[in-house]
């Protein structure tokens, strides 16, 4: 059976394609696909920030090659940023660490 | 209940701390901690590459700030690279796509 971390990586990949496969380039997320992915798969991250300008800003920030779409590499950078935010929260609670050094 | 992608991000964070918390700086992976993480959590990625030279090379590649340890950001870059490799494999099998465009 796959280990949790291997499963996590598989989820990252399959979630991307679940939405990138809906319209246009099937290996990229356009704005509406990104919006749907965020709303359905990352509701905790999104919170109440569902206004159009917020989505446009996020899309722009992720779209490093400026093609109006988010490719898998750009998506990975995004997930890494969220993971780093989660990690900062995690590191702020040392009692939650699995073991002290 | 957390969505699969949110769970995946949580696993990324908790797996890092499960090993970084063993010795030295509790927010970084030293070489032995990295080796243990890879062996136990990413056996499919590692395969048979368990020789010392391979580990040294991988450690060197991940350690972008050259402090002989892998911090959370460097670990995220590493996981993104693995995810991108998985994605290339995934994209190579169009019949596995959730939907054609």
């Amino acid at each position: 059976m796959a280990c949790p971390l291997e499963k996590a990586l598989d989820v990252m990949v399959s979630t991307f394609h679940k939405y990138s496969g809906k319209e246009g380039d099937k290996f990229k997320l356009n704005k509406s696909e990104l919006k749907e992915l965020l709303t359905r798969e990352l509701p905790s991250f999104l919170g109440k920030r569902t206004d159009e300008a917020a989505f446009q800003k996020l899309m722009s920030n992720l779209d490093s090659n400026r093609d109006n779409e988010v490719d898998f590499q750009e998506y990975c950078v995004f997930l890494s940023c969220i993971a780093m935010m989660c990690n900062e929260f995690f590191e702020g609670f040392p009692d939650k660490q699995p073991r002290k050094k | 209940m957390a969505c699969p992608l949110e769970k995946a991000l949580d696993v990324m964070v908790s797996t890092f701390h499960k090993y970084s918390g063993k010795e030295g700086d509790k927010f970084k992976l030293n070489k032995s901690e990295l080796k243990e993480l890879l062996t136990r959590e990413l056996p499919s990625f590692l395969g048979k590459r368990t020789d010392e030279a391979a580990f040294q090379k991988l450690m060197s590649n991940l350690d972008s700030n050259r402090d002989n340890e892998v911090d959370f950001q460097e670990y995220c870059v590493f996981l993104s690279c693995i995810a991108m490799m998985c994605n290339e494999f995934f994209e190579g099998f169009p019949d596995k796509q959730p939907r054609k465009k």
Epitope: K31, K57, S60, S64, R66, D67, N68 | -
Partner: antibody, heavy 120, light 107 residues
């Protein structure tokens, strides 16, 4: 109201490096925008040079890439352009612009432009 | 690079006329087409983005349409302040490229 102001020498000798700075005022020099350089040749044609944006991400026009360098100083609300080994063909009005985050990333604010002449 | 071709390169019109300028891209730019107006000695100003969306403060007599490779800028009733040069620009991919411009002159 966002304002952009280009500054730098108006005359550059051939083979030297053209250096320009753009100062942004009226809006914080935020990560939400990309900051561009565009030039307009005497014949009125417009050419995109490059931009700098989120996380310091930089994209250059491939036709100029090997001569081009862009940077930014967020503490001064400035970004700059260096174009090396200039020739008379680089004579143009140079504009700095802000690229909006809306669909198609239009250039919504422009500096007034600065004429750079390459001549000995 | 995506080539942008504008036509006509210049036109003469009178106040009140309906004016149409076309822009053709060398490949599909998926509606990521922006239009600018430039007056002599001034910087270009954004008019429309994403084919048909009016930039803030731009009069409603300006409109845009098109898809794929072919796009149009229309001025429904030309005003004295509209005599200028108009440029299209694709925002689909890098490097960004512009059309050669259309100069609208007084007849």
């Amino acid at each position: 109201q966002v304002q952009l102001q280009e500054s730098g020498p108006g005359l550059v000798k051939p083979s030297q490096t053209l250096s320009l700075t753009c100062t942004v005022s009226g809006d914080s020099f935020t990560n939400d925008y990309y900051w561009n350089w565009i030039r307009q040749f005497p014949g009125k044609g417009l050419e995109w040079i490059g931009h700098i944006g989120y996380g310091g991400n930089i994209n250059y026009n491939p036709s100029l890439k090997n001569r081009l360098s862009m940077s930014r100083d967020t503490s001064k609300n400035q970004f700059s352009l260096k174009l090396s080994s200039v020739t008379a063909a680089d004579t143009a009005v140079y504009y700095c612009t802000r690229e909006s985050f809306y669909d198609g990333y239009p250039f919504d604010y422009w500096g007034q432009g600065t004429l750079v002449t390459v001549s000995s | 690079d995506i080539q942008m071709t504008q036509s006509p390169s210049s036109l003469s019109a009178s106040v009140g006329d309906r004016v149409t300028i076309t822009c053709r891209a060398s490949q599909d730019i998926r509606n990521y087409l922006n239009w600018y107006q430039q007056k002599p000695g001034k910087a270009p100003k954004l008019l429309l983005y994403y084919t048909s969306r009016l930039h803030s403060g731009v009069p409603s007599r300006f409109s845009g349409s098109g898809s794929g490779t072919d796009y149009t800028l229309t001025i429904s009733s030309l005003q004295p302040e509209d005599f200028a040069t108009y440029y299209c620009q694709q925002g689909n991919s890098l490097p960004r490229t512009f059309g050669g411009g259309t100069k609208v002159e007084i007849k």
